[in-house]
């Protein structure tokens, strides 16, 4: 059976989160997708969404969030760049399917952003270095105002996933140290 899980990413200010959410290609390829934050005791809040209908491999940038929907492959890529401590929280990808409730995708992301110097990646056996620049031309999409009422905010155990930032470029490191915890079955 499919389990709803959380994956915890511990990053430093100025670093980036680079994740993907998969969806059923046949059902949702051109549907509008969104990236939401779920804060304790609050309704999920939509931060960014793809266009409607969603365009294939067309980056959409809303502030520091970049969404790219590879709907030939059933994958939504989400990048949050130049992370701030206040970005910490529980995130999820959803698919808008009005008039029905948004459809939540697996997995949820527990992001913990801490202050501190993000220098050169260390010698951790899992460390990686993905440097990329924010796409120069992107489109801001209008997102529906409604949010999903489903909230689950169980905190998983600690894990490590460091990232570092030289100047304006973003390095992603230690993404393999992410912890997965079941939220419910």
């Amino acid at each position: 059976a499919t389990k709803l899980t959380e994956e915890k990413y511990e990053l430093k200010e100025g670093q980036t989160l680079d994740v993907k959410c998969d969806y059923t290609l046949e059902k949702f390829a051109s549907s509008q997708k969104a990236w939401q934050i779920i804060r304790d005791g609050e309704m999920p809040k939509t931060l960014a969404c793809t266009e409607r209908p969603s365009k294939n491999s067309h980056p959409v940038q809303v502030g520091r969030i970049i969404l790219e929907d590879y709907h030939d492959h059933g994958l939504l890529r989400v990048r949050m760049v130049n992370l701030q401590v206040e970005d910490s929280g529980l995130y999820q990808c959803v698919i808008y399917q009005p008039p029905k409730e948004p459809h939540m995708l697996f997995d949820r992301i527990r992001l913990v952003v801490t202050k501190g110097f993000s220098g050169t990646p260390g010698s951790n056996e899992n460390s990686t270095q993905n440097v990329y620049k924010i796409p120069p031309t992107t489109t801001k999409a209008l997102c529906p105002l409604y949010t999903s009422p489903r909230t689950v905010t169980q905190a998983p155990p600690k894990s490590t996933a460091d990232v570092s930032t030289p100047d304006s470029e973003i390095n992603l490191t230690n993404v393999t140290d992410i912890i997965r915890v079941p939220v419910f079955n």
Epitope: T2, K3, E7, D18, D22, F106, Q129, N130, I178, R180
Partner: antibody, heavy 123, light 107 residues
């Protein structure tokens, strides 16, 4: 340690289908995507697509989209790749591969490979 | 789709030589590039990920560099066991594609 053990070699006639299995051990099967890569004899590597064993969702390159089906049985930690309407140019070694990072990480580094399954298509 | 062009397609070198293989992407792929080694009759093995990071257990004579469109894979001192075909692979976007391979042999 992580192991991916694939099913044995197959000989098929043109137009037939083949289903290759990939049994995973040494890690939590539902935590990492399984990808499929093929290699025709003496040729280079060709990515076919991916599957998330937790959600069951999958995606494949346009070239294979109408002919390939990727499934899994989580109870026995096994992934399957079925290729239909076989033609002679599908003769290749098919590899299942596990990525370096968890399913949610955008990180397509092929860290753990099965031993490969030779599929021969011949009339 | 992004095309990955490796050069040379084959090369012959002596034990102890410094060997360099290049990989060129058809457009900027930042550092989303991996290198693999494949010995005859075996599955490929990940050597370098994200352009320059050495996979655990891989000898330090192997290294990678570059970003954007031009990448280099280097063996600082060729050993007999390094005889293999080497492939680059990008993942800047989907679909993922590989270079055509570089076959390395001992003189």
């Amino acid at each position: 340690q992580v192991q991916l053990v694939q099913s044995g070699a197959e000989v098929k006639k043109p137009g037939a289908s083949v289903k290759v299995s990939c049994k995973a051990s040494g890690y939590t099967f539902t935590s990492y995507d399984i990808n499929w890569v093929r290699q025709a004899t003496g040729q280079g590597l060709e990515w076919m697509g991916w599957m998330n064993p937790n959600s069951g969702n999958s995606g494949s390159v346009k070239k294979f989209r109408d002919r390939v089906t990727m499934t899994r049985d989580t109870s026995i930690s096994t992934a399957y790749m079925e290729l239909s309407s076989l033609r002679s140019e599908d003769t290749a070694v098919y590899y299942c591969v596990r990525l370096i990072g968890y399913s949610s990480a955008y990180k397509w580094s092929f860290q753990h490979w099965g031993q490969g399954t030779l599929v021969t298509v011949s009339s | 789709d992004i095309q990955m062009t490796q050069s040379p397609s084959s090369l012959s070198a002596s034990v102890g030589d410094r060997v360099t293989i290049t990989c060129q992407a058809s457009r900027d792929i930042s550092k989303y590039l991996n290198w693999y080694q494949q010995k005859p009759g075996k599955a490929p093995k990940l050597l370098i990920y994200d352009a320059s990071n050495l996979e655990t257990g891989v000898p330090s004579r192997f290294s990678g560099s570059g970003s954007g469109t031009d990448f280099t894979f280097t063996i600082s001192s060729l050993q007999p066991e390094d005889i293999a075909t080497y492939y680059c692979q990008h993942y800047d976007n989907i679909p993922i594609t590989f270079g055509q391979g570089t076959r390395l042999e001992i003189k």
